[in-house]
């Protein structure tokens, strides 16, 4: 997978998400998540994988909200 620079792409975001991943990450690969800062130009949910990668996702995608619910419940 192509890794984009930390401040501009969906991988390894530092503060804000500037683009979102275009694929659905398998649930079993995700360990944690956090929301980007509300001051960012666009909202983002950052999923942290078991390998330590951080991936920017679109909060409006159903699978993203489903994963958040699942992690909150567990």
């Amino acid at each position: 997978t192509k890794t984009e620079s930390s401040s501009r792409g969906p991988y390894h975001p530092s503060e804000c998400c500037f683009t979102y991943t275009t694929y659905k990450i398998p649930r079993q690969r995700i360990m944690d998540y956090y929301e980007t800062n509300s001051q960012c130009s666009k909202p983002g949910i950052v999923f942290i994988t078991k390998r330590g990668h951080s991936v920017c996702t679109n909060p409006s995608d159903k699978w993203v909200q489903d994963y958040i619910k699942d992690m909150k419940e567990n």
């Epitope: 666009k42 679109n58 909060p59 409006s60 699978w63 909200q65």
Partner: antibody
């Protein structure tokens, strides 16, 4: 299943707009609500949305002066927009989606809209 | 931000004819595109999502196609009831709508 916006009306510049979206026939715990507006003779413009778990997100232009909240007991979602200008004159729609179309921004339940006019 | 540019209005077609409305995105949106129909004084109605999938209850004469940055809504066997404004929506990035294209049925 339906959604309905509260009455709009005439506002003065710098006023604060408060609109309520009342939903019927479905639960806010399984649906997201979007707010979209349409200036006279113009295209649709997204304002923001609140997820089925109650988190609100906003378009970049609207973020600094918009707040979306919900009351699950009353099945209502409220849009508050501050510092109105003439450019905010538009028909305001609320729209619901349950993610059936893979994304909560894709809405299949729309209210009739309510006209908001900002003029001194 | 993504910019969606639609076919200029109005687009005219005879009853029974074919109408094509184009929507061009300023960057690739991976088929995360919906089409809405809006009649005067009414709210939008969802027609198509994921660029080509018909929403529930939408007649099969409506067809969506395209990928990358170029998308098309085609209406075959146009009926009087199809006179409306058609708008595209991208939901890959920032939830942007096109400016709308008015379809006139003669």
């Amino acid at each position: 299943q339906s959604v309905k916006e509260s009455e709009g009306g005439l506002f003065k510049p710098a006023d604060t707009l408060t609109l309520t979206c009342t939903v019927s026939g479905f639960s806010l715990s399984s649906y997201a609500i979007n707010w979209v507006r349409q200036a006279p003779g113009e295209g649709l413009e997204y304002i923001g949305w609140i997820s089925d778990v109650g988190t609100a997100y906003y378009a970049s232009w609207a973020k600094s002066r918009s707040t979306i909240t919900r009351n699950t007991d009353e099945n209502t979602v409220t849009l508050k927009m501050t510092s109105l200008t003439a450019a905010d004159t538009a028909t305001y729609f609320c729209a619901g989606g349950d993610g059936s179309y893979s994304n909560y921004w894709v809405s299949d339940i729309w209210g009739q809209g309510t006209l908001v006019t900002v003029s001194s | 931000a993504v910019v969606l540019t639609q076919t200029a209005s109005p687009v005219s077609a005879p009853v029974g004819g074919t109408v094509t409305v184009k929507c061009q995105a300023s960057q690739t949106i991976n088929s995360r595109l919906a089409w809405y129909q809006q009649k005067q004084g009414q709210p939008p109605k969802l027609l198509i999502y994921e660029a080509s999938t018909l929403a529930s209850g939408v007649p099969s004469r409506f067809k969506g196609s395209g990928s990358g940055t170029e998308y098309t809504l085609t209406i075959r066997g146009v009926e009087c009831a199809d006179a409306a404004t058609y708008s595209c929506q991208e939901y890959a990035d920032e939830n942007i709508f096109g400016g709308g294209t008015e379809v006139v049925v003669k």
